[in-house]
Amino acid sequence: TPEVWVQVRMEATELSSFTIRCGFLGSGSISLVTVSWGGPNGAGGTTLAVLHPERGIRQWAPARQARWETQSSISLILEGSGASSPCANTTFCCKFASFPEGSWEACGSLPPSSDPGLSA
């Protein structure tokens, strides 16, 4: 069964800046990746970025840079300032859509530790 992993890290240099990394563990080819915060995209979450392997990347503030790392993983950097900036307990979710298999999603947040780290 395919799985999705999510890692959230707070940048040491900019403590209000976040990096979200997500990956798809499965054999299907990815058609679309949606990154949201505040919960899954279908349950009240707000879309931060949509990445399509052919048609490009769309992103919305406070997303600063979304990119493909590999054919099955992506990363997203969030701006750390402004009213819409994330806080330490914000949940980030990634949804990978693969045709014709379907969609898989997972969520993660910053680890409880005050140090920058990872959350699977």
């Epitope: 080819s29 058609s31 399509h52 949804k95 859509a97 045709f99 014709p100 298999e101 379907g102 969609s103």
Partner: antibody, heavy 120, light 107 residues
Framework: EVQLVESGGGLVKPGGSLRLSCAAS????????MSWVRQAPGKGLELVSA????????YYLDTVKGRFTISRDIAKNSLYLQMNSLRAEDTAVYYC?????????????WGQGTLVTVSS | DIVMTQSPDSLAVSLGERATINCKAS??????VAWYQQKPGQPPKLLIY???HRFTGVPDRFSGSGSGTDFTLTISSLQAEDVAVYFC?????????FGQGTKLEIK
């Protein structure tokens, strides 16, 4: 304007074969996933087969596996469904449909359909 | 397989009145739910995708809502041209599945 035009339907005896075609125009055919959906007389909709834009990943309804083959010819902007060992229960209108990644794989455009009747 | 169950099977509503069609999934389908309208002798037409987004050219009297397993298509003020069969559809997990359809008529 997006257009999908099916052909190839007709009356065939049980055990016979048909090849359905769907001529696509008005969009970049190679960039979209495509499907065949059927509707038996007075009944609901059933996804029969689907093919990824990469032409590698495919889906078949359990009851047609081993009998039907989906394919496409990018040069001719055409989708095909080769139907072998036809049964009475395959009688239906067969629709060609396009899937839109950005719409959660919803089928945003459909052809008018072609009627397949399997009867002795 | 994910089973999509629509209710009611048929519905009669007066012109100008509200029509509501429900769709229940046998398991969570995230937001990957679409609604289609099919008139006699015609192919289905996409009305709503991602639960609540109207497709190009669809009148704003059509709206979709819901999450998880329960979804609703609402026509705020029924028009004569809305007489049709309506299908919900999930594209969250293969195999994609449809509801059995709801026949909407004028009372």
């Amino acid at each position: 304007e997006v257009q999908l035009v099916e052909s190839g339907g007709g009356l065939v005896k049980p055990g016979g074969s048909l090849r359905l075609s769907c001529a696509a125009s008005g969009f970049t055919f190679s960039s979209y996933h495509m499907s065949w959906v059927r509707q038996a007389p007075g009944k609901g909709l059933e996804l029969v087969s689907a093919i990824n834009s990469n032409d590698i990943n495919t889906y078949y309804l359990d009851t047609v596996k081993g009998r039907f083959t989906i394919s496409r010819d990018i040069a001719k902007n055409s989708l095909y469904l080769q139907m072998n060992s036809l049964r009475a229960e395959d009688t239906a209108v067969y629709y060609c449909a396009r899937h839109e990644d950005y719409y959660g794989f919803a089928m945003d455009y459909w052809g008018q359909g072609t009627l397949v009747t399997v009867s002795s | 397989d994910i089973v999509m169950t629509q209710s009611p099977d048929s519905l009669a509503v007066s012109l100008g009145e509200r029509a509501t069609i429900n769709c229940k999934a046998s398991q969570s389908v995230s937001n990957d739910v679409a609604w289609y309208q099919q008139k006699p002798g015609q192919p289905p037409k996409l009305l709503i995708y991602y639960v609540s987004h109207r497709f190009t050219g669809v009148p704003d009297r059509f709206s979709g809502s819901g999450s998880g397993t329960d979804f609703t298509l609402t026509i705020s003020s029924l028009q004569a041209e809305d007489v049709a069969v309506y299908f919900c559809h999930q594209a969250y997990r293969s195999p994609w599945t449809f509801g059995q359809g709801t026949k909407l008529e004028i009372k």
